[in-house]
């Protein structure tokens, strides 16, 4: 999957663009909005009717090295009585993000962008019957 | 990718930090093996905390299109289709990394940017706040 070139006609390549080798791109890893914070409601992972746990995956050759993945705790959803209602399903909500992968080849290093799928949390859905044609 | 020689200390002295500027292969590797969009494509409608998806487009960013979720109701949808306001629909947010063209309009020069997206909604029991 290649990153598309800027398509708009008024997007002429400015003179100030840095020279980049063919088939590559220049990437500044100094993050814009580095200190932005998630302002999600408190403890939603335990208060949800489709609660989830978090697992941290760690890879020193990935940036960011820490990626947090959610796992739904139940097959069903928690009802008002605190019981698991299996007429409903807890399902994962996923989001793609980019990571930067560092690869070692002998005494040299290369960098590759990767799309990874992060499970962000869970939601409670009504299953539907598959009707055979 | 583009191979960058390590310093003379190789192979012992590995830099634990990523360099400030790197050359990266234009091809983006896709690691998503266990997902199938047809399965999750209608969660936004079937959830007890349904949401609408809003298109956020920016040609100076990769990916240029990001979908933002907005919960449809304050409460959660019951089996009978009515909204239960004893429960709350709340957004699930996630920080993701995107690429921002820098300098602007440059086809092959980017900077990493962290953005906050609402991915979907979940139904939660509200917290009762007791005033001391």
């Amino acid at each position: 999957r290649k990153i598309p070139k800027v398509g708009h006609t008024f997007f002429q390549k400015p003179e100030s663009c840095p020279p980049v080798p063919e088939g590559s791109m220049k990437l500044d890893t100094g993050i814009i909005n580095e200190n932005q914070r998630v302002s999600m409601s408190r403890n939603i992972e335990s208060r949800s009717t489709s609660p989830w746990n978090y697992t941290v995956t760690w890879d020193p050759n990935r940036y960011p090295s820490e990626v947090v993945q959610a796992q739904c705790k139940h097959l069903g959803c928690i009802n008002a009585q605190g019981k698991e209602d299996i007429s409903m399903n807890s399902v994962p909500i996923q989001q793609e993000t980019l990571v930067l992968r560092r690869k070692h080849q002998g005494c040299s290093v290369s960098f590759q962008l990767e799309k990874v799928l992060v499970t962000v949390g869970c939601t409670c859905v009504t299953p539907v019957v598959h009707h055979v044609q | 990718g583009i191979a960058i020689p390590r310093n003379s200390g190789c192979p012992n002295s590995e830099d634990k930090n990523f360099p400030r500027t790197v050359m990266v292969n234009l091809n983006i590797h896709n690691r998503n093996t266990s997902t199938n969009p047809k399965r999750s494509s209608d969660y936004y409608n079937r959830s007890t905390s349904p949401w609408n998806l809003h298109r956020n487009e920016d040609p100076e960013r990769y990916p240029s299109v990001i979908w933002e979720a907005k919960c449809r109701h304050l409460g959660c949808v019951k089996a009978d289709g009515n909204v239960d306001y004893h429960m709350n629909s709340v957004p699930i947010q996630q920080e993701i990394l995107v690429l921002r063209r820098e300098p602007r309009h440059c086809p092959n020069s980017f900077r990493l940017e962290k953005i906050l997206v609402s991915v979907g909604c979940t139904c939660v029991t509200p917290i009762v706040h007791h005033v001391a």
Epitope: E84, S90, P92, V128, H130 | -
Partner: antibody, heavy 123, light 107 residues
Framework: EVQLVESGGGLVQPGRSLRLSCAAS????????MHWVRQAPGKGLEWVSG????????GYADSVKGRFTISRDNAKNSLYLQMNSLRAEDTALYYC????????????????WGQGTTVTVSS | EIVLTQSPATLSLSPGERATLSCRAS??????LAWYQQKPGQAPRLLIY???NRATGIPARFSGSGSGTDFTLTISSLEPEDFAVYYC?????????FGQGTKLEIK
């Protein structure tokens, strides 16, 4: 023809292990959650375990939790049940069954069943 | 767990007669109840799901009704192939559970 064929049953001593397999054909296997249901001789049906389309959601009956492991290989259209620390009360005919829910989720109602494989736990 | 009690344990009827099988839940299961038929030496067969919906290929003589705790499977006019054991099953609360079965035999 939609079909499920179980195998791997047999006579085993208490405390030993057995692995059951179920080969699916005639439908898109990874579009559905799958289940194991057992029936002790002369008795009724007991749900044992279930697994969703991509193995992301798995459930077990309390009677087998910690001893049995359900898994699936979508590339091979196969469902498995690894049974460890077997007990006399695990003696039963084990059925593999397909869930009726779309999108690989759980409905917990089953519309396609195999003919079953017999597991006998005895010393 | 939810206990499903089926009655009667055995029902003796003749072909052409109407059969009424009952399933009672220890607590409400809403309409999340299914019915299965099992003949000797065969696997169970799904007849009804969600209390009243006939599964694919099931003849119209089979019908289900009820909600909450009391459910009924009705076979309007018995055919010789209908004599079997019938099980109800709930999918309301964890874990899914089956009733002990009703044996429908030829009188």
């Amino acid at each position: 023809e939609v079909q499920l064929v179980e195998s791997g049953g047999g006579l085993v001593q208490p405390g030993r292990s057995l692995r059951l397999s179920c080969a699916a054909s005639g439908f898109t296997f990874d579009d559905f959650a799958m289940h194991w249901v057992r029936q002790a001789p002369g008795k009724g049906l007991e749900w044992v375990s279930g697994i969703n389309w991509n193995s992301g959601s798995i459930g077990y009956a309390d009677s087998v939790k910690g001893r049995f492991t359900i898994s699936r290989d979508n590339a091979k259209n196969s469902l498995y049940l690894q049974m460890n620390s077997l007990r006399a009360e695990d003696t039963a005919l084990y059925y593999c069954a397909k869930d009726i829910a779309a999108a690989g989720e759980f409905y917990f109602d089953m519309d396609v069943w195999g003919q079953g494989t017999t597991v006998t736990v005895s010393s | 767990e939810i206990v499903l009690t089926q009655s009667p344990a055995t029902l003796s009827l003749s072909p052409g007669e109407r059969a009424t099988l009952s399933c009672r839940a220890s607590q409400s299961v809403s309409s999340y109840l299914a019915w299965y038929q099992q003949k000797p030496g065969q696997a169970p067969r799904l007849l009804i799901y969600d209390a009243s919906n006939r599964a694919t290929g099931i003849p119209a003589r089979f019908s289900g009704s009820g909600s909450g705790t009391d459910f009924t499977l009705t076979i309007s006019s018995l055919e010789p192939e209908d004599f079997a054991v019938y099980y109800c099953q709930q999918r309301s609360n964890w874990p899914p559970t089956f009733g002990q079965g009703t044996k429908l035999e030829i009188k």
